[in-house]
């Protein structure tokens, strides 16, 4: 039975040209996290394997930085970066947990961070 929950940074906004940290945290389970995948819609941005470390897609390596921790930093943001991002936790023996973050990239300088929320 999967008992874990993923807490994410929720709905967030950031300024065009700036950077943002996407962060997820898996709790309420003793399952071993073997890998975390970061995806944007249908594209795989990066993976972080518990033993082999980070592997960033060459398509994104200029604008994606690993960390902090299991999070992902997006740099040089454009309005095209607006959309859904997913952290996918591969665990043993539980299986897969998925968290969702919605990022809005704003033209103005009034970007504010949204609230945190949980996905069971």
């Amino acid at each position: 039975m999967m008992t874990g929950t993923i807490e994410t940074t929720g709905n967030i906004s950031a300024e065009k040209g700036g950077s943002i940290i996407l962060q997820c945290h898996l709790s309420s389970t003793t399952a071993q996290v073997t890998q975390v995948n970061w995806e944007q819609q249908d594209q795989l941005l990066a993976i972080c394997n518990a033993d082999l470390g980070w592997h960033i897609s060459p398509s994104f390596k200029d604008r994606v930085a690993p960390g902090p921790g299991l999070g992902l930093t997006l740099q040089s943001l454009t309005v095209n970066d607006t959309g859904e991002y997913f952290c996918i936790y591969h665990t043993y023996p539980d299986g897969t947990y998925t968290g969702r973050i919605f990022l809005e990239v704003l033209e103005s300088s009034v970007a504010e961070h949204g609230a945190r929320f949980q996905i069971p």
Epitope: T34, Q43, D51
Partner: antibody, heavy 114, light 107 residues
Framework: EVQLVESGGGLVQPGGSLKLSCAAS????????MSWVRQTPDKRLELVAT????????NLPDSVKGRFTISRDNAKNTLHLQMSSLKSEDTAMYYC???????WGQGTSVTVSS | DIVMTQSHKFMSTSVGDRVSITCKAS??????VAWYQQKPGQSPKLLIY???TRHTGVPDRFTGSRSLTDHTLTISSVQAEDLALYYC?????????FGGGTKLELK
């Protein structure tokens, strides 16, 4: 030039033990996660163990869990695979592999037979 | 575990031919796919990673592509030295798994 040189293979009886080693050179060994991948006589490849760069985390599939142990000595640039309770299905060529499988050693052969 | 199926164990070709080696994943693995070449008596060597990126020193006649769960390694003009075993691998989900291999041989 990246070099990975495996040793320690041989013929062993079922239930026996063997320790494989891999000497690494040409790169900063302590910065890379490492793996052991085996190739069975029918040429199938199977990842049998991974270890974090600092040795603090390891992962092994169910097929070898409890029988195999992966370890490393960063001071000596060496990777190890301790294999015990060996079975005939463990017969394979064992390769030491760097990081995300970008460099492989030449392999060391393990035969489990009575 | 994700199963990577290389349906052709053998493929016959001629020098100069264009050949495509296919691999089907049992579920979507996005672009987390690598391809390896293994010549007789040698260890596997990385050719392609992230589905389409060539490893250092790999000739540009080798290209990788993806269509949903179907992954393809294409050699645009086969050379004699390309006759070898080719494996796909997924690293989308642990445990990482390999295809059964495709042996490229001369007609």
């Amino acid at each position: 030039e990246v070099q990975l040189v495996e040793s320690g293979g041989g013929l062993v009886q079922p239930g026996g033990s063997l320790k494989l080693s891999c000497a690494a050179s040409g790169f900063t060994f302590s910065s890379y996660g490492m793996s052991w991948v085996r190739q069975t006589p029918d040429k199938r490849l199977e990842l049998v163990a991974t270890i974090k760069s600092d040795g603090g985390s390891t992962n092994l599939p169910d097929s070898v869990k409890g029988r195999f142990t992966i370890s490393r000595d960063n001071a000596k640039n060496t990777l190890h695979l301790q294999m015990s309770s060996l079975k005939s299905e463990d017969t394979a060529m064992y390769y030491c592999v760097r990081g995300y499988f970008d460099y492989w050693g030449q392999g060391t052969s393990v035969t489990v037979s009575s | 575990d994700i199963v990577m199926t290389q349906s052709h164990k053998f493929m016959s070709t001629s020098v100069g031919d264009r050949v495509s080696i296919t691999c089907k994943a049992s579920q979507d693995v996005k672009t987390a796919v690598a391809w390896y070449q293994q010549k007789p008596g040698q260890s596997p060597k990385l050719l392609i990673y992230w589905s389409s990126t060539r490893h250092t020193g790999v000739p540009d006649r080798f290209t990788g592509s993806r269509s949903l769960t179907d992954h393809t390694l294409t050699i645009s003009s086969v050379q004699a030295e390309d006759l070898a075993l080719y494996y796909c691998q997924q690293y989308y989900s642990t445990p990482y798994t390999f295809g059964g291999g495709t042996k490229l041989e001369l007609k």
